[in-house]
């Protein structure tokens, strides 16, 4: 089984643009890293800007689901 832990200080630069870094702890596989991106950014490492139009659409969808 695997679980997420926050990245160590030295690993935090895996994610950019303020993304929060997590390590996937899995005994059967090498460590993998995941990023939780700040609003306005996307991609595996939070490298890409999300166009404002798309951001607004996402917010609208969130509100609709609530």
């Amino acid at each position: 089984t695997s679980h997420l832990v926050k990245c160590a200080e030295k690993e935090k630069t895996f994610c950019v643009n303020g993304g929060e870094c997590f390590m996937v702890k899995d005994l059967s596989n090498p460590s993998r890293y995941l990023c939780k991106c700040q609003p306005g950014f996307t991609g595996a490492r939070c490298t890409e800007n999300v166009p404002m139009k798309v951001q607004n659409q996402e917010k609208a969808e969130e509100l609709y689901q609530k």
């Epitope: 200080e9 935090k12 630069t13 643009n17 490298t47």
Partner: antibody, heavy 116, light 107 residues
Framework: EVQLVESGGGLVQPGGSLRLSCAAS????????IHWVRQAPGKGLEWVAA????????NYADSVKGRFTISADTSKNTAYLQMNSLRAEDTAVYYC?????????WGQGTLVTVSS | DIQMTQSPSSLSASVGDRVTITCRAS??????VAWYQQKPGKAPKLLIY???FLYSGVPSRFSGSGSGTDFTLTISSLQPEDFATYYC?????????FGQGTKVEIK
């Protein structure tokens, strides 16, 4: 052993095109972040472009946006830099580098000269 | 874009000297700063990442410190092979940006 080998540099006229390649080996290509960095003769390092092979995310320096295109072929473990509308100021040694928590591995570089 | 300003742009030192190079970011970059060494005709080599962590295989005479906007690379006892140009680089935001370099020359 991690290895990055750039190729495709050469002499090209202003307005011309070149495609640089960065062949990678010794690591999980899809799990990294690949950068192109250039260095004009006698000058410092200038970041050019980057791609995350895992999802195809790309970034470009303003100086090359609309002229250069970065891409990656995960089946060949190779990154590319397609350079169009080349200018004299693009003359430089072009390096590819992998990034895990910083730019940890660099190729030997390939020289691009833009001149008539 | 974030500007990285290195100082000094060059310095002369002798073998055994303690050398300090500073790098100032134009805005907060947390600890997302790396330092590289480059010798003429060669590719840069990573020395320090995440502001203070020594990269694998790099001699312990190299150290890094700082957070926020001010960062330092220190060589505790300069060796003949350390004469080179050093660059700082931030990766807190895209685009990543480099300092202009500091050339360490023999006195």
């Amino acid at each position: 052993e991690v290895q990055l080998v750039e190729s495709g540099g050469g002499l090209v006229q202003p307005g011309g095109s070149l495609r640089l390649s960065c062949a990678a080996s010794g690591f999980t290509f899809s799990g990294t972040w690949i950068h192109w960095v250039r260095q004009a003769p006698g000058k410092g390092l200038e970041w050019v472009a980057a791609i995350t092979p895992a999802d195809g995310s790309t970034n470009y320096a303003d100086s090359v946006k609309g002229r250069f295109t970065i891409s990656a072929d995960t089946s060949k473990n190779t990154a590319y830099l397609q350079m169009n509308s080349l200018r004299a100021e693009d003359t430089a040694v072009y390096y590819c580098a992998t990034y895990m928590f910083a730019m940890d591995y660099w190729g030997q570089g390939t020289l691009v000269t833009v001149s008539s | 874009d974030i500007q990285m300003t290195q100082s000094p742009s060059s310095l002369s030192a002798s073998v055994g000297d303690r050398v300090t190079i500073t790098c100032r970011a134009s805005q907060d970059v947390s600890t997302a700063v790396a330092w590289y060494q480059q010798k003429p005709g060669k590719a840069p080599k990573l020395l320090i990442y995440s502001a203070s962590f020594l990269y694998s295989g790099v001699p312990s005479r190299f150290s890094g410190s700082g957070s926020g906007t001010d960062f330092t690379l220190t060589i505790s006892s300069l060796q003949p092979e350390d004469f080179a140009t050093y660059y700082c680089q931030q990766s807190y935001t895209t685009p990543p940006t480099f300092g202009q370099g500091t050339k360490v020359e023999i006195k």
